[in-house]
């Protein structure tokens, strides 16, 4: 049985203010059972960016259809980027439970925001 890997291929992404940022994340196994969530930052101060359960997350869309079966692509797009969005984004797999528990994190993608071109 294949051990789950969470692949965030981009160490860093630079986006101009007002544009959209795509943050890539793919997984290599459907196991363990449980959801994927995106956060900005690490530790207790981290900010939830997207999951299927909470929300709405009006600026976030999933790159793949949310109804796609056996999907391994959990990339997201964040629209209308502002300097406040700068930070490191983590794609994290949770193990199903009561409550769900964090199982494994991607290495993170650092988002930097450039000034809007004049």
């Amino acid at each position: 049985e294949e051990e789950l890997q969470i692949i965030q291929p981009d160490k860093s992404v630079s986006v101009a203010a007002g544009e959209s940022a795509i943050l890539h994340c793919t997984i290599t196994s459907l196991f363990p059972v449980g959801p994927i969530q995106w956060f900005r930052g690490a530790g207790p101060a981290r900010v939830l960016i997207y999951n299927q359960r909470q929300g709405p997350f009006p600026r976030v869309t999933t790159v793949s259809e949310t109804t796609k079966r056996e999907n391994m692509d959990f990339s997201i797009s964040i629209s209308n980027i502002t300097p406040a969005d700068a930070g490191t984004y983590y794609c994290i797999k949770f193990r199903k439970g009561s409550p769900d528990t964090e199982f494994k994190s991607g290495a993170g993608t650092e988002l930097s925001v450039r000034a809007k071109p004049s």
């Epitope: 459907l30 196991f31 059972v33 999933t62 692509d73 009561s98």
Partner: antibody, heavy 120, light 108 residues
Framework: DVQLVESGGGVVRPGESLRLSCAAS????????MTWVRQAPGEGLEWVST??????YYADSVKGRFTISRDNSKNTLYLQMNSLRAEDTAVYYC???????????????WGLGTLVTVSS | EIVLTQSPATLSVSPGERATFSCRAS??????LAWYQQRPGQAPRLLIY???IRETGIPERFSGSGSGTEFTLTITSLQSEDFAVYYC??????????FGGGTKVEIK
Amino acid sequence: DVQLVESGGGVVRPGESLRLSCAASGFRFSNFAMTWVRQAPGEGLEWVSTIGSGDTYYADSVKGRFTISRDNSKNTLYLQMNSLRAEDTAVYYCAKDSTVSWSGDFFDYWGLGTLVTVSS
Amino acid sequence: EIVLTQSPATLSVSPGERATFSCRASQNVKNDLAWYQQRPGQAPRLLIYAARIRETGIPERFSGSGSGTEFTLTITSLQSEDFAVYYCQQYYDWPPFTFGGGTKVEIK
């Protein structure tokens, strides 16, 4: 073609044990969660248990009495049922889970079921 | 635990007619709802998932709609093989996965 074939059902007395098996073919068994669902005579469907890789989940009504397991080398799912009660009498179906990417699981293939009767 | 309530319990319809029945969830399940058909003496068969997506091989006369707490399954022109029991199932919040009590579609 996906095929799920249950076996191991039968008539037992209350308090006894039974082990159900489900032989799977036509898909990469080790890649998918698997589930047992039961249906009492003339009643609706009731979820019993689900297994991922090693992670297991149970309905409250069977927790502590039933154990789900799998042998990926044999493409087989099991349900060990101990301390059986009259209310466990049902057809037990084995089902393959299908995962919707950001959500949960539903069941896209089902076996024909095996009947378990618990009676004194 | 999310409770699913299906109505009506029984629906009497003539062949060729339209059948519509509902599934109500006790709390919001977004679109995380599936529909199954169970013919007498057979195993359930997946018809619809994600509230509205037809499973491969399911005829177009079957359609699902709704989101949140109210869902509907519609069969536009009932064929003889459609007389069966239909169950909804939520997979938004589990364990446990929960099923509705079923709607039996019988010949009028």
